[in-house]
């Protein structure tokens, strides 16, 4: 059997491999050692017994989408049946005091691989026995502690494979410089040690995306905006736009990034090198926001001008492929997809990202101020309580609701929250009366709201003992 027979549904073409060369990966035309690594089809009854106590689930994730030329990282995590975990030695053990369907286990080990490897690997001094090899026959790398790595992961994509020895979690990074744009499929097959052979325990696949568009996200924030996710904002208050570029491998770290904004309100283009920008809309309506991000990223060098016609015949591309596929070294530039590149030359290519949003601008409450506070004299039966009137003004639209949150002087521990509808005149002047139980310093947060906005003001007040001679003080 060949790798593509085992790992994929169909034999990938050489064309696919040639157009998607992954550095350090091997062609899936290579032979697979079925004696050491048995192959079971989906539905084979042997899967039921591939793991003690249930099935192992493999979870494959990636930091896709990846900008072409950057690295994409794949992570595989194994999820064991209930009550099982990997210990520091790489053995699979039962968790203490954990009950599963079989009850508490007397044997602490699900798989004691340490004991197995001590029994079976003593046949030569190197520790490199004929079974410590990957499915293609390559020997396991002897990193420190490699004997505690008991899982073999075979990654397969674009007609190529990559083998990795690991524990219950592994990561593999792939450079996408030569990967065709668009969605691609990554498949992973996981084997576990089983004496002097291996047993398949899980298979998983996931789609990843390679793009030549910079992946761009924009967050928008505006003070007093009631709902930041509905793309409705308030007139006459600045909106802060923050551009996030998805670049987990830091491919663009050394690039100069330019942000070109069009806010759709006839204010023209705004170009910046800062990822945040503030913009205030002064009219109500619907506006089309457009952002173009431009970065000079590392990229392939442009083809040199065509040389004068050769007097001797040029080697054919088919010959080129043959020498490349069979891993026999050829003259520089034999790689067909490198024909147009100049070795060791650092060329740059402009990459672009785009973001578009439709923004609705409406009237809202722009500002709220407490202009006066008055202690309301109360009849004698309530000596512990104080009634205070807050005279409040606002700017912008007319509020429909007022809320007061009374808390401790640090403004962290809420003691009392009261919300009530309000009916305010055009002048936006209202009085809010609130009760304070006992003397002391209080933090008062007062918000005025309508359907789209929520404006806040805060103050610290000092409520005196019920001595008529002591005045009410605004602590700040």
């Amino acid at each position: 059997k060949r790798f593509h027979d085992v790992l994929g549904n169909e034999r990938p073409s050489a064309y696919m491999r040639e157009h998607n060369q992954l550095n350090g990966w091997s062609s899936d035309e290579n032979d697979w050692n079925e004696k050491l690594y048995p192959v079971w089809k989906r539905g084979d009854m042997r899967w039921k017994n591939s793991w003690k106590g249930g099935r192992v689930q493999a979870v494959l994730t990636s930091d896709s989408p990846a900008l072409v030329g950057s690295n994409i990282t794949f992570a595989v995590n194994l999820i064991f049946p209930r009550c099982q975990k990997e210990d520091a030695n790489g053995n699979i053990v039962y968790e203490k005091n954990c009950r599963n369907e079989a009850g508490l286990s007397a044997d602490p080990y699900v798989y004691n691989w340490t004991a197995w490897s001590e029994d079976s690997d003593g046949e030569n001094g190197t520790g490199q026995s004929h079974h410590n090899v990957f499915p293609d026959g390559k020997p396991f790398p002897h990193h420190p502690g490699w004997r505690r790595w008991n899982f073999i992961y075979v990654f397969h994509t674009l007609g190529q494979y990559f083998q990795k020895l690991g524990r219950c979690s592994v990561r593999v990074s792939v450079n996408t410089a030569n990967v065709t744009l668009g969605p691609q499929l990554m498949e992973v097959t996981v084997y576990r040690r089983h004496g002097r052979a291996y047993v398949p325990i899980a298979q998983v696949k996931d789609v990843y995306v390679v793009t030549d568009q910079i992946p761009v996200f924009v967050t928008m924030f505006q003070k007093n905006d009631r709902n930041s996710s509905d793309e409705t904002f308030l007139k006459d208050l600045p909106i802060m736009f923050d551009v996030l570029i998805h670049d987990p491998s830091h491919f663009l770290n050394y690039s100069t990034i330019n942000y070109k904004w069009s806010f759709g309100d006839n204010t023209g283009l705004f170009v910046s090198t800062n990822h945040t920008v503030n913009h205030t809309y002064v009219l109500n309506g619907t506006f089309s926001l457009n952002l173009t991000v431009k970065a000079a990223a590392p990229g392939p060098c442009p083809p040199p001008p065509p040389p004068p016609r050769p007097s001797k015949p040029t080697p054919s591309l088919a010959t080129t492929l043959k020498s490349y596929d069979s891993n026999t070294p050829g003259p520089a530039g034999d790689n067909p997809l490198e024909l147009s590149r100049i070795p060791d030359e650092n060329c740059q290519i402009n990459r672009y990202g785009h973001f578009q949003a439709t923004i609705t601008i409406v009237e809202g409450i722009l500002e709220v101020n407490i202009i006066q506070m008055t202690d309301v004299l109360m009849p004698v039966p309530w000596p512990e309580s104080s009634l205070i009137d807050f005279v409040v003004t606002c700017q912008g639209s007319i509020p429909t609701e007022v809320c007061t949150i009374i808390s401790d002087p640090t403004c962290e521990i809420t003691q009392n929250t009261v919300c009530s509808p309000v009916d305010v005149d055009e002048m936006c002047l209202l009085t809010v009366r609130r009760t304070f139980n006992g003397s002391g310093t209080y933090c008062v947060n007062l918000t005025l709201g309508d359907d789209t906005s929520l404006a806040l003001t805060s103050t610290l007040i000092s409520v005196p003992d019920r001595d008529p001679a002591s005045p009410l003080r605004m602590a700040n």
Partner: antibody, heavy 119, light 107 residues
Framework: QVQLVQSGAEVKKPGASVKVSCKAS????????MHWVRQAPGQGLEWMGE????????NYAQKFQGRVTMTVDKSTSTVYMELSSLRSEDTAVYYC????????????WGQGTLVTVSS | DIVMTQSPDSLAVSLGERATINCKAS??????LAWYQQKPGQPPKLLIY???YRYTGVPDRFSGSGSGTDFTLTISSLQAEDVAVYYC?????????FGGGTKVEIK
């Protein structure tokens, strides 16, 4: 919908060069390799080469190496095929064709450009 | 280069009858083989890719089969509009190569 629109017919003298354009629309231009295939009158189809619109990488068939140059203009979503040192046997209809991602079959073709080489 | 050999060069079949075209590759290209139909004055039209997958909108009377080096295009019931030249193409490796074509006519 996907469209590949090629430039008009050309008549050239032997030894001259011809540059044929192919303007793409209806899909993400940079995501698919573009190929050039030619067909001499009454003959079969012959693959000339391909270009990656994303970064300008090219592969040419050995027969045309040194005589063909494929280029791309991303701003107009157009690829170009220039054939130099023309001879009478280069008289043919030249097609651009879009590949299917990682697969080199062609679901989309230009309408063809007839290049006549005659003294 | 992979050489693609088509047979027969031409084929005359009665309306409603089965037409079979063969294509042989000089090396294993499985399953990377496509079939095209070309009518006079038009570009080729993709019928089958990856040996047996019918392209969107292609009538189901067209089917592809085969593996390794031997492939077949079958038109199960020939219609008048099927009169054309048919080409096979290997999409296994560069340089991409086409068969010489098979002309299908009505008997």
């Amino acid at each position: 919908q996907v469209q590949l629109v090629q430039s008009g017919a050309e008549v050239k003298k032997p030894g001259a060069s011809v540059k044929v354009s192919c303007k793409a629309s209806g899909y993400t231009f940079t995501s698919y390799w573009m190929h050039w295939v030619r067909q001499a009158p009454g003959q079969g189809l012959e693959w000339m080469g391909e270009i990656n619109p994303s970064d300008g990488r090219t592969n040419y068939a050995q027969k045309f190496q040194g005589r063909v140059t494929m280029t791309v203009d991303k701003s107009t979503s157009t690829v170009y095929m220039e054939l130099s040192s023309l001879r009478s046997e280069d008289t043919a209809v030249y097609y651009c064709a879009r590949s299917g991602g990682n697969y080199a079959w062609f679901a989309y073709w230009g309408q063809g450009t007839l290049v006549t080489v005659s003294s | 280069d992979i050489v693609m050999t088509q047979s027969p060069d031409s084929l005359a079949v009665s309306l409603g009858e089965r037409a079979t075209i063969n294509c042989k590759a000089s090396q294993d290209v499985s399953p990377s083989l496509a079939w095209y139909q070309q009518k006079p004055g038009q570009p080729p039209k993709l019928l089958i890719y990856s040996a047996s997958y019918r392209y969107t909108g292609v009538p189901d009377r067209f089917s592809g089969s085969g593996s390794g080096t031997d492939f077949t295009l079958t038109i199960s019931s020939l219609q008048a509009e099927d009169v054309a030249v048919y080409y096979c193409q290997q999409h296994y490796s560069i340089p991409l190569t086409f068969g010489g074509g098979t002309k299908v006519e009505i008997k």
